[in-house]
């Protein structure tokens, strides 16, 4: 005889009792009323199961909570099912069996019916696991039930001091959705908060789980698919203060069925968003947007932020949102890169875009900007990267497109192409009043607007000029003079420079900043405007360094161990990290610090010039890095501000040296022998290049490298021209914020 193999199947759910009412006492597990009612309700549940063919499999059950409606019982039960029947007893089948029993008139074994009038319609049965029950049981010492009335913002009481795990069981009116707001009040903690689209902590109904005080999302709002949610907290380390604040609201279902007609222009025309954006989208989200385009000359571009779409096999669920665009199924996924989906127009009736959440696990709300593009010329003067839908500079020596096609088939790479014979001349020789091309095409159209391209400078009126790097060179090249605006920058305070020396003199690098915590130099930076210092995002990598309040910025400083009259200090009012910064890859390694009060410029304190996106820093050019970093690998920081000249390195040469880990947002500089390099403590400091006008432009920020000054391993810097749009955006947006 062989014993039958059984498996324990766990079910979780709720049922509504019509002849009972919820009372506050029933909401407290420690009350006598709760103990008495839960014992009776459990007996009722056991009898209900026993009245069906499931009775033979019954193992155990528990009614662990009560809620409104008139009285809702929340329970779990375990059935020991023969292995061969496991798949046939799905939650749907179990629910059907129990509903049939509730609707039947048979009086056998139905003593539970005399005391409890159970609403068959309201029976909910979900699949659970033994682990879910373990998690649930671990929270029972700190189990909080709350009913959320419409219109109220209900603050939830924080965890009890002595507990290690708590569960907030949230319920609202049937026709509304639960929305939870979680705000981290500290920067470092090891707590875990998980939110579930169910009354209990069912792994299969997890909406999101956050570990540690999330710096990326200090405040998050999360939607359930309906009127129930469970929030579970697990303690990380002992702390007297709660590391978070929780509040909850019941909100109406928001429709996202939209019909839009676009105008015949190429700028951004609006956005599509998931309901309650920027809240996490709900597990029940289904949006349908119909966009009508004015003519077939245009295509539709959807501009995503830190989210992208890709093809996925039909048998695979989309875990971060499913998109249907013109009958093409695409899956969304979060990414630290920009992305555009381009939809070519083939029919005049426009395009329908559907967004659906296929699983309970969701993510931050999705916002998509939309615009039209010219189907015959989608990227004027640039290259359309089919991998990510973006327009990128072509033939500039930097592979912006992941497949590198923007640098293929180039007649001239990072050079000017003569019209006469397709020879290439160096960019500084264009519009320099000296013909270099055979028929002088490099000196034509220098006084008029030209089509915009990779190396043309875009004036404020959006026209472009042919002369490379025309900013602040003392000559007005734009019709509107915008190339000579904002030019109070890039001039050294003192003319005597110690050429070839290592120690800097006062006023030599007046934009140099020292970023300090409690009097200790941590990183370098550069002054770029009267309230703004730029530095590297990785300086704020550690949780203990993430708060702006900790930092002091020194400008005009020369020596770390002493102060002198030329230096000034500032507190930091706000810190902006590039949203795409990725610690592991060092990509987008840039941050902006807003100072608590404006800087008064002097001979020793003044900003460096910011390059335009089109500014070209030529490989082979000699530039300078400055900082108080270590003078040898592993050494202490320097007392006196050091300077060193380095040479800009062709991107592919550096990429080879670093096994292709160098992104388009990175720039390499150094010394093939090694020796001359940035080091620990220089991070975030400026790499500056002098233009023929005598002004210094910010080419890079000290970011990373293998060791310091090692042969064949150059220093890697954040390429400022590739993050300048973000810099300008932050500066413009937060100009008046004090």
């Amino acid at each position: 005889y062989k014993a039958e193999v059984t498996v324990s199947q766990v079910y979780s759910g709720s049922l509504r009792v019509l002849n009972r009412h919820f009372s506050q006492d029933l909401g407290r597990r420690e009350s006598i009323a709760f103990r008495s009612e839960s014992a009776k309700a459990q007996k009722m549940l056991q009898e209900l199961v026993a009245s069906t063919r499931l009775g033979t499999y019954y193992n155990s059950s528990s009614v662990y909570s009560f809620g409104e409606g008139p009285l809702t019982c929340f329970f779990w039960f375990i059935l020991d099912i023969p292995e061969y029947q496991r798949l046939t007893l799905s939650p749907e089948v179990v629910r059907e069996l129990l509903v049939d029993e509730l609707l039947s008139n048979s009086s056998t074994l139905a003593s539970y019916k005399t005391e409890y009038e159970v609403d068959p319609e309201g029976l909910v049965i979900l699949e659970a696991s033994v682990n879910d029950i373990v998690v649930l049981n671990s929270t029972l010492g700190c189990y909080r039930y709350s009913y959320v009335n419409p219109g109220q913002v209900l603050p939830l009481k924080g965890p009890d001091q002595q507990t290690t795990s708590c569960l907030w069981h949230l319920q609202g009116p049937e026709d509304l959705m639960i929305k939870v707001r979680l705000e981290w009040t500290r920067v470092d903690c090891r707590d875990r908060v998980a939110m579930y689209d169910a009354a209990g902590p069912l792994e299969k109904r997890l909406i999101t789980s956050v570990y540690g005080c999330s710096r990326q999302e200090p405040v998050m709002e999360v939607l359930a698919s309906g009127s129930v949610m469970a929030v579970v907290w697990k303690k990380g380390m002992h702390s007297y203060y709660d590391p978070f604040l929780l509040s909850v609201k019941s909100v109406a279902f928001q429709d996202c069925q939209v019909n839009l007609t676009l105008e015949g222009r190429l700028d951004t025309q609006g956005f599509l968003r998931t309901p309650y954006y920027p809240s996490y989208y709900s597990p029940s989200t289904h949006c349908s947007w119909h966009l009508t385009v004015p003519s077939l000359d245009y295509g539709l571009a959807l501009w995503f932020d830190a989210y992208a779409l890709r093809r996925q096999k039909y048998n695979r669920l989309c875990t971060q949102g499913q998109w249907m665009i013109q009958n093409r199924r695409l899956c969304g996924f979060r990414t630290l890169q920009p992305y555009a989906e381009r939809i070519p127009m083939v029919a005049s009736d426009g395009v329908t875009i559907n967004f659906t959440s296929q699983i309970s696990l969701t993510g931050p709300g999705v916002q998509v900007y939309y615009s039209l593009y010219n189907q015959s010329d989608p990227c004027p003067g640039e290259f359309l990267c089919s991998v990510n839908g973006l327009c990128v500079p072509a033939c500039d020596g930097i592979k912006d497109c992941p497949n590198g096609l923007d640098e293929r088939n180039c007649v001239c790479r990072a050079m000017f192409q003569c019209q006469e014979d397709s020879t290439c001349i160096s960019l500084p020789r264009v519009c320099d009043r000296q013909p270099d091309c055979l028929n002088g095409s490099d000196e034509e159209q220098c006084q008029e607007g030209v089509p915009c391209g990779t190396f043309t400078f875009q004036c404020e009126d959006r026209s472009c000029v042919k002369k490379p790097n025309p900013e602040c060179d003392g000559q007005s090249d734009c019709r509107d003079g915008s190339d000579e605006q904002h030019c109070d920058c890039g001039l050294q305070g003192l003319s005597s420079r110690i050429v070839g020396g290592t120690v800097s003199s006062e006023g030599e690098w007046p934009w140099q900043a020292s970023l300090q915590i409690r009097g200790r130099h941590i990183c370098g930076g550069a002054l770029i405007a009267d309230r703004w210092v730029i530095t590297a995002a990785h300086c704020f990598q550690e949780d203990s360094m993430a708060s702006p309040k900790l930092w002091t910025v020194f400008l005009g400083k020369m020596r770390q161990n002493s102060r002198w009259p030329g230096e000034v200090s500032f507190k930091v009012s706000r810190l902006f990290l590039h949203p795409y910064h990725e610690e592991d890859s060092h990509d987008y390694d840039v941050a902006l610090l807003q100072l608590d009060h404006p800087v008064v410029y002097s001979a020793t304190v003044r900003p460096v010039c910011l390059p335009a996106r089109s500014h070209f820093f030529e490989p082979g050019q000699h530039c300078w890095i400055t900082g108080w970093g270590a003078q040898r690998e592993g050494g202490p920081v320097s007392n006196t501000l050091q300077k060193v000249d380095v040479q800009l390195v062709p991107q592919d040469l550096c990429s080879e040296a670093y096994r292709y880990q160098v992104s388009p947002r990175m720039l390499c500089a150094g010394y093939r022998k090694g020796k001359k390099d940035a080091c620990q403590g220089d991070s975030g400091g400026p790499l500056v290049c002098r233009e023929p006008s005598g002004r210094w432009f910010l080419a890079g920020l000290v970011s990373w490298g293998l060791g310091c000054g090692r042969p064949n391993f150059f220093g890697v810097y954040t390429r400022v021209t590739r993050v300048i749009n973000w810099i300008q955006q932050v500066l413009t947006h937060h100009h008046h914020h004090h």
Epitope: R413, A414, M415, S426, G620, V649, P650, Y671, R672, P711
Partner: antibody, heavy 118, light 107 residues
Framework: EVQLQQSGAELVKPGASVKLSCTAS????????IHWVKERTEQGLEWIGR????????TYAPQFQGKATIIPDTSSNTAYMQLSSLTSEDAAVYYC???????????WGQGTSVTVSS | DIVMTQSHKFMSTSVGDRVSITCKAS??????VAWYQQKPGQSPKILIY???TRHTGVPDRFTGSISGTTYILTISSVQAEDLALYYC?????????FGGGTKLEIK
């Protein structure tokens, strides 16, 4: 003024070795790479290899591996190149030159003529 | 190894003429190409590096340019003292390689 002064012409027997010197003035060889280049009539210029005198790290062209050995003497600001097992193929003018950063060779010595004859 | 090919061993020109000497690289060396001038009995002298950058003291009649993977040294108005042997060299990766040289002669 930057100068690279090379040793005088050499007449050597087949199978023998020769050591050529290159003394720098006007700069410190430790801050630069020192290269050696071979020139044969009708054959043009051939890069032999280079040394970083600061740490002695060398790089050679494959065809000169085992043939040439470059060594520095930082105390005398001099770089040497030894050529071994000489044959008539090694008869040429040898130049030393310096380079910095990623740049090519900007200053060259006057050259040393090596004749291989029995 | 990267092969640098100077297809013309000799080029004839007259004083005052514009002349272009070419050099083709077997693979992409970005702009890491130098040009040297060598006169009889002398060592090579650098004229151009990074394909287009003139070395200090080099007359501005010498310019460097590129066409695809072909690197060009142009002398806008040939002077008598420019008659010499011209070499290109890639300084992109070791082993550094030279072109075979082009001898500029007077017609």
């Amino acid at each position: 003024e930057v100068q690279l002064q090379q040793s005088g012409a050499e007449l050597v027997k087949p199978g023998a070795s020769v050591k050529l010197s290159c003394t720098a003035s006007g700069f410190n060889i430790e801050d630069y790479y020192i290269h050696w280049v071979k020139e044969r009539t009708e054959q043009g210029l051939e890069w032999i290899g280079r040394i970083d005198p600061e740490d002695g790290e060398t790089t050679y062209a494959p065809q000169f591996q085992g043939k040439a050995t470059i060594i520095p003497d930082t105390s005398s600001n001099t770089a040497y190149m030894q050529l071994s097992s000489l044959t008539s193929e090694d008869a040429a003018v040898y130049y030393c030159a310096r380079s910095i950063y990623l740049d090519p060779m900007d200053y060259w010595g006057q050259g040393t003529s090596v004749t291989v004859s029995s | 190894d990267i092969v640098m090919t100077q297809s013309h061993k000799f080029m004839s020109t007259s004083v005052g003429d514009r002349v272009s000497i070419t050099c083709k690289a077997s693979q992409d060396v970005t702009t890491a190409v130098a040009w040297y001038q060598q006169k009889p009995g002398q060592s090579p002298k650098i004229l151009i590096y990074w394909a287009t950058t003139r070395h200090t003291g080099v007359p501005d009649r010498f310019t460097g340019s590129i066409s695809g993977t072909t690197y060009i040294l142009t002398i806008s108005s040939v002077q008598a003292e420019d008659l010499a042997l011209y070499y290109c060299q890639q300084h992109y990766s070791t082993p550094y390689t030279f072109g075979g040289g082009t001898k500029l002669e007077i017609k």
